[in-house]
Amino acid sequence: AGVFELQIHSFGPGPGPGAPRSPCSARLPCRLFFRVCLKPGLSEEAAESPCALGAALSARGPVYTEQPGAPAPDLPLPDGLLQVPFRDAWPGTFSFIIETWREELGDQIGGPAWSLLARVAGRRRLAAGGPWARDIQRAGAWELRFSYRARCEPPAVGTACTRLCRPRSAPSRCGPGLRPCAPLEDECEAPLVCRAGCSPEHGFCEQPGECRCLEGWTGPLCTVPVSTSSCLSPRGPSSATTGCLVPGPGPCDGNPCANGGSCSETPRSFECTCPRGFYGLRCEVSGVTCADGPCFNGGLCVGGADPDSAYICHCPPGFQGSNCEKRVDRCSLQPCRNGGLCLDLGHALRCRCRAGFAGPRCEHDLDDCAGRACANGGTCVEGGGAHRCSCALGFGGRDCRERADPCAARPCAHGGRCYAHFSGLVCACAPGYMGARCEFPVHPDGASALPAA
C-alpha cells in the first residue's frame, strides 16, 4: 500500500504566440481545481481501463479576477498535494490524466458553473520511494508544471511497496543505514541506492546501482534529453555543430505517435496530434470511460456507440458540454425578442415582455393585430404601440365586447336630444337646427347654412 502524490507548481499560458488570456475575467471571477486519474500502464489493455489505480480531486484554489490590460499570469493554485492512495502493489509504469477545471463564480442562477480548461496525459515509469519527478505538459495553449512521486505507507517498503518492514522494539542489530525487515527478524534491508550520479529528476532505479531513465531522457545517468542525444536528432545546418556530417533521422521518422496520431517536428523534439479519445506524449493513453465518472452535475454516462467517443454524457436540463460541466446560460442566446427581459428559472426560461409585445419570446407584436380578435364585428387597427379595435355601432371597449350607449358622448349639438336606436343613434334637433347631429343652423328664409361645396 502507498500514496501517489501530485504537486501542481503552475498552470498558465504556455510560451509562444496564441497564448490564451486568463480564463477568469473582471466580470466573471473564477478559481481552479485539478483532478488526477491514475491507471496501471503495464499493457495497452490496462490503458483502456478506468482509473484503476485511483483518482483524486484537489481543493478549490483562491478566487482570481483578471486585471484588465495585465498580461495573463500563472493562475493561483489550490493549497496542498493531490493524493491518490493505492492498496496493492505500485506498478512501476503508470498512465496519468490531469484535468484542470475552472469554477466560475459569477451570479449564475443555481450556483457556480464548471468547465474543463485543459487535460494532459502521459505514461511514465516511476519507482515507489524515489525522489520527486518533475514534468511539464502542454494542453493547447496552456502549460501545466507539476511534480509527482509514489511513496509506500509503513510497513510497506520497496520499489513496488510489496515488502513489509517493521521497526523493532529491540535494539537493531543491523548496521548503520540498514533497516530490519519482516518476515525474517535478522534480515536487514538496505535503502535503495541508484547508480552514483543518476539524475534525481529524470532517472530512477528498481535495483541498487542501476539508473533507468524516464521517458524523454537517455544516457548512462539520464541527463541527456532524447531529442539531443548524439548527433542523430538534429537535422540540417545544426548538425555541423555536433560534428556530424550526415543528418540523422528526424524525430518523426517511423512515426512515434500511436493510435493514428500524426507527428510534427518541433525545434527540440516532436509533437503528436492525437485523434479524439487519445492523449499523451505519443497518443498512447486512451480516453476516459464511464467508470471514471466523467459526467458532472447529475449527467448520465453511456458508452459511446463509435470508437471515437469512449462515453457520452446525457446532461440534465441547464447543463451542457462533453462532461455536463458547463451551466447553460440560455439567456445569453437572447431568446427574448423586442427588448424582452430574460429570466432563467433553471428548468425553463421566462421572457418578461415590453409593452406592446407578447408571446413566449415576446415575438408577437400586439400592434399587428395577429392573434387579437375584435368582437361584435369590430375591426383591428394597427399602430400607436398597441392594437386598437374600431367597433361596430352599438359596441365599445378595447375588444368591442361592451355594449355601448351611443348617446353617452352627447353627440347631438345645439341642444338636440339623443335617442338610442338598434342601428346607432338618432338626434331630434332643437328648433332652428338640422343635420344628423343637429350641427347646421336653419336660416329664417328657410335656407340652411350648409358648408360651401
Partner: antibody, heavy 118, light 107 residues
C-alpha cells in the same frame, strides 16, 4: 421524467366537433407555455396553437382561427384543444408539446389521430 | 407567414458517413431556428435550438450552424439509428412554421 399523453382522437364527421386532451406529468405544468402541433398522414409538421402558462395569451394558425380553442387546467396538469366545424383537411395526428422558453418544443407527446370523414 | 424550405427532400448515405441538410427561410429569422428528428410512427425529437445549441441529451455528432436565412444541420459518423426524417422550424414570429422535411435513408 417528463411525460405528455394525448387522448380524445377518433373518427368524426365533417362539421363535427372533437375535444383533445393532453395529460402532463414529471414537470411543473403551470410554468410552461404549451403547444398543439399536427401532422397530416404522410405530410410534414404544422403548428396549430399555443397558450401561456396562466392561459392569458393564446395564438392560432390562420387555418384554425375561429374554429379551434386551446385551453388549460393547471390544477389538473391538462391541456385541451376544442375543435369545431371540422374539415377533411384537419385529419392529422395531433401532438402536444412543451415550450421551455429557449425554443418552442422540447418534449412531445406520442400523438393522437383525428380522422375527419363522412 | 415565413416559409421554410429544406434541401434535399431525401438523401441516401452509408453508416459512418457525414451528411448535411440545409434549410432556407423566406425572410431573415436571426438564429430563431430549431431542428427535429422524427422516426416513422414516433413523435418528433428536439435536436438543436437557437440554430446551433444542442438540446440536452443529444450527442455532439449533431451540429447546427447558420443565421439570417440560411441554416445547416450536420450529422457526423452516421449510425443506423440516425436514419430518419429531419425538420427545421422557425420561431422568429407567429405562426411558427416547419420545413417540409428531409428523409435520410440508408444506402
Amino acid at each position: 421524467e417528463v411525460q405528455l399523453v394525448e387522448s380524445g382522437g377518433g373518427l368524426v364527421q365533417p362539421g363535427g366537433s372533437q375535444r383533445l386532451s393532453c395529460a402532463a406529468s414529471g414537470f411543473t405544468f403551470s410554468s410552461y407555455w404549451m403547444n398543439w402541433v399536427r401532422q397530416a398522414p404522410g405530410k410534414g409538421l404544422e403548428w396549430v396553437a399555443n397558450i401561456k402558462e396562466d392561459g392569458s395569451e393564446k395564438y392560432y394558425v390562420d387555418s384554425v382561427k375561429g374554429r379551434f380553442t386551446i385551453s388549460r387546467d393547471n390544477a389538473k396538469n391538462s391541456l385541451y384543444l376544442q375543435m369545431n366545424s371540422l374539415r377533411a383537411e384537419d385529419t392529422a395526428v395531433y401532438y402536444c408539446a412543451r415550450d421551455p422558453g429557449w425554443a418552442p418544443f422540447d418534449y412531445w407527446g406520442q400523438g393522437t389521430l383525428v380522422t375527419v370523414s363522412s | 407567414d415565413i416559409q421554410m424550405s429544406q434541401s434535399p427532400s431525401s438523401l441516401s448515405a452509408s453508416v459512418g458517413d457525414r451528411v448535411t441538410i440545409t434549410c432556407r427561410a423566406s425572410q431573415g429569422i436571426s438564429n430563431y431556428l430549431a431542428w427535429f428528428q422524427q422516426k416513422p410512427g414516433k413523435a418528433p425529437k428536439s435536436l438543436i435550438y437557437a440554430a446551433s445549441s444542442l438540446q440536452s441529451g443529444v450527442p455532439s455528432k449533431f451540429s447546427g450552424s447558420g443565421s439570417g436565412t440560411d441554416f445547416t444541420l450536420a450529422i457526423s459518423s452516421l449510425q443506423p439509428e440516425d436514419f430518419a426524417t429531419y425538420y427545421c422550424q422557425q420561431y422568429n414570429s407567429f405562426p411558427y412554421t416547419f420545413g417540409q422535411g428531409t428523409t435520410l435513408e440508408i444506402k
